[in-house]
Amino acid sequence: AVNGTSQFTCFYNSRANISCVWSQDGALQDTSCQVHAWPDRRRWNQTCELLPVSQASWACNLILGAPDSQKLTTVDIVTLRVLCREGVRWRVMAIQDFKPFENLRLMAPISLQVVHVETHRCNISWEISQASHYFERHLEFEARTLSPGHTWEEAPLLTLKQKQEWICLETLTPDTQYEFQVRVKPLQGEFTTWSPWSQPLAFRTKPAALGKDT
């Protein structure tokens, strides 16, 4: 029997990717393991090789098709299994019935760009990547701005409770370097979580106009 504590967590990006992490106390680092996806109502199945990410955890991505293809729906259930090589046979180490649209984590937003910048404000836009058309407008965003002398963790979170792919940052300091990040989350799904943060976008506010001599 399997010993030690085990955890098997997977997320669906809403299109054609299921990313999984498996952790197992006391598992052998050099053991060959894979994740096998077995849908309940589709003809395909898929596997990916688990690769070590730390001392006792492994990760892999199940690529179900072309990045923007809609491979699963809200009614699908995919049985996911961790299989590890034991001599000549594969042994099931972990198993779960995975409901893709209850376990969503979208890709990080992309194509961040400065639309307009002034001395005290900056308008930034972005795009979402590989997000299902099923969501329509049912998405929310969080954004944060890195100010000089601070860390990302200290940055206050700005919440956009609707599908709004732009933001106007106010009360900025003139002639100052900032960085900006955004992440996205569907409203759907009991175990849905935030996407990773986008790549940071660096921008600089315009200098204040010099006052005229009197």
């Epitope: 399997v2 098997f8 197992q24 042994r91 180490m93 972990a94 198993i95 779960q96 019935d97």
Partner: nanobody, 125 residues
């Protein structure tokens, strides 16, 4: 080798209750994901409820949610399925099954390694 023996089946009227038992020998419950799977005449096996090993998370098929409850007694090495508000469509042979893994499955009964012989449940007036 793990062995599973079911009991508690029988004939019951619609709306009635039954409690099925699954006695496990040759291993401890802590080491196995346990599922209750049923098969009605002329139909495929379908998952009813299951319990993950170690964390004891429980799962139920939509058609039995709120009516069936899975539980276990570690001291007796036994898993139970309490069934209330039984319907004629619950009539089937009920199997207890075990998988030597973390987690369990309702939608793919073939993932289970060990099976009991089954116990007949008939819901009829």
């Amino acid at each position: 080798q793990v062995q599973l023996v079911e009991s508690g089946g029988g004939l019951v009227q619609p709306g009635g209750s039954l409690r099925l038992s699954c006695a496990v020998s040759g291993g401890t419950l802590h080491d196995y994901g346990i599922g209750w799977i049923r098969q009605a005449p002329g139909k495929q096996r379908e998952g009813v409820s299951c319990m993950s090993r170690s964390d004891d998370k429980t799962y139920y098929a939509d058609y039995v949610k709120g009516r069936f409850t899975i539980s276990k007694d570690n001291a007796k090495n036994t898993v139970y399925l309490q069934m209330i508000s039984l319907k004629p469509e619950d009539t089937a042979v009920y199997y207890c099954a075990a998988v030597d893994a973390y987690g369990c499955s309702l939608v793919q009964p073939t993932t289970y390694d060990y099976w009991g012989q089954g116990t007949q449940v008939t819901v009829s007036s």
